[in-house]
């Protein structure tokens, strides 16, 4: 349905509060260096303009597209070129090229300091003084650091943030109340950020069809009682919504997401028996709840998948005449039977099935050729199952920090050319898979592990694409999205790598390490570990254990010393010498 004024339409649908939040997110994701004050000024101008269009849809400029209106606002910023360099060149283009240009300039790793949470008292004071401004800052700070964050979901996290502060700021021990609750929100939001980045990568690199296949598999797992036509409708809608958000159409994205939630709640009977609890919530919470919904129970009487996809005489005809429908149906049928598989695995199985038909159907006896296809899935299923088993066992043995270190060693050996901060970030995130997934029931482990790892590896790929340094990483990253994780898992020590020179200053530490929070301390140690591996890529596990054990003792000892600086200055060189010797 066409509207005279797109901006008026969105303002009316979303309401002022959500409209303003989304506009702020959009501007913060496009111009990541601008201060909050500058963006909020633009947001207010856009909001005022939207209100004039609501009052009169025929008012001047109200018929312009939202991209045109937003782009014009951004391009009017003084000193745009000084702050953003070549991004300013986008302003010479016309829509839709101008928006495409803005999207290409989004920086996945902006040069911004880590977001520091203020001290509890200070936080509560500024929240109570001006909740709107406080939450605005939150949206701005998250959005500029995560330029592909799913905007309606970020509004939901801001709402959660608001709830926590409202609740905790009245407590006597504000910090004790705030810290665990805000940590939980932060953890969920960070995972949401990498997951959404993966969705946008899928959309950007492989197009809508690839994303829709992902959505069909996911929806089929969640709603195994829904018909294929229903799953296709939901997958099509989800694809459209994600395309809009990934493309910077945040108002349309949020509006369509709310519409989808409404549709799902109106059609529970044909979708899932688990939706009711979500449908009683307000819009943001409703959409979030539906996105996280538990799987419905699998129908009891499902026939063997072989009947329609192996034994049927018309398999090849059905494949050749409508691959999208036939393979979509295969993916639907297989996925609804396997909530215990990762979406990545289901897509690999569908790809294998497609490749088998493509190879067999033109042959003299196709059924004889494709007859064993389901049995040929076995190795593809076993590989991630073994990955989960070995990694969860290692996690249980080492704990999160130790497991992160094991992953860090492994990945530094695979791709020693990658920068140490990137390797440390990736390994820390990959290492969290243990805490996140290994404690789950058996049936939930595989989907949790593999789909999480895929999202983290996508982040590694996105960062590596900016400054490619490792041929092996490039090779894994440029292949199909669903093959990335197996590709990285299969990488071995890079034999072409020339070890780094041993630099004493890399392993020189000072007393400032003692006052760092635990997380920062860990990062310092892990940075040293990655550098050690870069120096000695073939160091044994025992050698690395010895050196890192020595290092931990050294830090511990000097941080307890009366004269810390002196301890670090005298003991440090001894440690470096011992480490060199141990690795010789």
């Amino acid at each position: 349905e066409a509207h005279k004024s797109e901006i008026a339409h969105r303002f009316k649908d979303l309401g002022e509060q959500h409209f303003k939040g989304l506009v702020l997110i959009a501007f913060s994701q496009y111009l990541q260096k601008c201060p909050y004050e500058e963006h909020i000024k633009l947001v207010q101008e856009v909001t005022d303009f939207a209100k004039t269009c609501v009052a009169d849809e025929n008012a001047e400029n109200c018929d312009k597209s939202i991209h045109t209106l937003f782009g014009d606002k951004l391009c009017a910023i003084p000193k745009l070129r000084d702050n953003y360099g070549e991004l300013a060149d986008c302003c010479a283009k016309q829509e839709p090229e101008r928006n495409e240009c803005f999207l290409q300039h989004k920086d996945d790793n902006p040069n911004l300091p880590p977001f520091q949470r203020p001290e509890a008292e200070a936080m509560c004071t500024s929240f109570q003084e001006n909740p709107t401004s406080f939450l605005g800052h939150y949206l701005h700070e998250v959005a500029r650091r995560h330029p592909y964050f799913y905007a309606p979901e970020l509004l939901y996290y801001a709402e959660k943030y608001n709830e926590v502060l409202t609740q905790c700021c009245t407590e006597s021990d504000k910090a004790a109340c705030l810290t665990p609750k805000l940590d939980a929100v932060k953890e969920k939001a960070l995972v949401a950020a990498v997951r959404q980045r993966m969705k946008c990568s899928s959309m950007q690199r492989f197009g809508e069809r690839a994303f829709k296949a992902w959505a069909v598999a996911r929806m089929s797992q969640r709603f195994p009682n829904a018909e294929f036509a229903e799953i296709t409708k939901l997958a099509t809608d989800v694809t459209k919504i994600n395309k809009e958000c990934c493309h910077g159409d945040l108002l349309e994205c949020a509006d369509d997401r709310a519409e989808l939630a409404k549709y799902m709640c109106e059609n529970q009977a044909t979708i899932s028996s688990k939706l009711q609890a979500c449908c009683d919530k307000p819009v943001l919470q409703k959409s979030q709840c539906l996105a996280e919904i538990e799987h419905d129970n699998i129908p009891a009487d499902l026939p063997s998948i072989a009947a329609d996809f192996v034994e049927d005489k018309e398999v090849c005809k059905n494949y050749a005449e409508a691959k999208d429908v036939f393979l979509g149906t295969f993916l639907y049928e297989y996925s609804r039977r396997h909530p215990d598989y990762s979406v990545s695995l289901l897509l690999r199985l569908a790809k294998k099935y497609e490749a088998t038909l493509e190879k067999c159907c033109a042959e003299g006896d196709p059924p004889a050729c494709y007859g064993t296809v389901l049995a040929e899935f076995q190795p593809l299923v076993e590989e991630p199952k073994n990955l989960v088993k070995t990694n969860c066992e290692l996690y249980e043995k080492l704990g999160e920090y130790g497991f992160q270190n094991a992953v860090l060693v492994r990945y530094t050996q695979k791709a020693p050319q990658v920068s140490t901060p990137t390797l440390v970030e990736a390994a820390r995130n990959l290492g969290r898979v243990g805490t996140k997934c290994c404690t789950l029931p058996e049936a939930q482990r595989l989907p949790c592990v593999e789909d999480y790892l895929s999202a983290i590896l996508n982040r590694l790929c996105v960062l590596h694409e900016k400054t490619p340094v490792s041929e092996k990483v490039t090779k894994c990253c440029s292949g199909s999205l669903v093959e990335r994780r197996p590709c990285f898992s299969a990488l071995t020590v890079d034999e072409t790598y020339v070890p780094k020179e041993f630099k004493a200053e890399t392993f020189t530490f000072h007393s400032d390490i003692c006052t760092l929070p635990d997380k920062e301390k860990q990062i310092k140690k892990q940075t040293a570990l990655a550098e050690l591996v870069k120096h000695k890529p073939k160091a044994t596990e025992d050698q690395l254990k010895t050196v890192m054990g020595d290092f931990a003792q050294f830090v511990d000892k000097c941080c307890k010393a009366a004269d810390k600086d002196n301890c670090f200055a005298t003991e440090g060189p001894n440690l470096v010498a011992r480490s060199k010797e141990a690795l010789a």
Partner: antibody
């Protein structure tokens, strides 16, 4: 050496019929899919249809009904039966093998030299 | 309706030149089912590239293909005298019945 050789082309009146043959030598035809592709004078390529080794056929939407592909593996030959011919069917008709290992992809690695069909009164 | 648009329809170039031909498909081709053919006057087409970027054996490495989804490119890095010909892209879709060729690009001597 593998060869595909078309025959049966010539002059035919509008509304008439013609059967083209594609004789294959150097390989056992029973293992391969064969396509028919045509090219009007001075124009581009146009896919007509395919016959798989099993005998299953598929046609371009515009070709359904008037064109029929068949095969005789004992003679190592594929046929294209064309009915209700029109002036716009005037073209060089080629047979071409689909690259082994593919069934529906437009990858044709072996081609005949073509046979000219002229539809005119 | 399936549309396979090749551009330019003709290009004049000299030996040693780099030549780029593009092929735009609507909708997107199925699973990178895209091929490139070379045809010389009076001869049958010859398959150069399949799966958008894979070179058929015996085809010189100066030919390369790239792209995915809807936009594809054939590049001849350094044109040789034997490369003057007409080039066609071919696309496969969800239905085999939609198999289509582009309109062709004639590469002529400048």
């Amino acid at each position: 050496e593998v060869q595909l050789l078309e025959s049966g082309g010539g002059l035919v009146q509008p509304g008439g019929s013609l059967r083209l043959s594609c004789a294959v030598s150097g390989i056992d035809l029973s293992n391969y899919a064969i396509n028919w592709v045509r090219q009007a004078p001075g124009k581009g390529l146009e896919w007509i249809g395919i016959i798989w080794a099993s005998g299953t056929t598929f046609y371009a939407t515009w070709a359904k009904g008037r064109f029929t592909i068949s095969r005789d593996n004992s003679k190592n030959t594929v046929y294209l039966q064309m009915n209700s011919l029109r002036a716009e069917d005037t073209a060089v008709y080629y047979c071409a093998r689909t690259v082994p290992g593919y069934s529906t992809a437009p990858y044709f690695d072996l081609w005949g030299q073509g046979t000219l069909v002229t539809v005119s009164s | 309706d399936i549309q396979m648009t090749q551009s330019p329809s003709s290009v004049s170039a000299s030996v040693g030149d780099r030549v780029t031909i593009t092929c735009q498909s609507s909708p997107s081709v199925w699973s990178n089912f895209l091929s490139w053919y070379q045809q010389k006057p009076g001869k049958a087409p010859k398959l150069l590239i399949y799966e958008a970027s894979k070179l058929t054996s015996g085809v010189p490495s100066r030919f390369s293909g790239s792209g995915s989804g809807t936009d594809f490119t054939l590049t001849i890095s350094s044109l040789q005298p034997e490369d003057f010909a007409t080039y066609y892209c071919g696309g496969g879709y969800s239905s085999i019945s939609d198999t289509t060729f582009g309109g062709g690009t004639k590469v002529e001597i400048k």
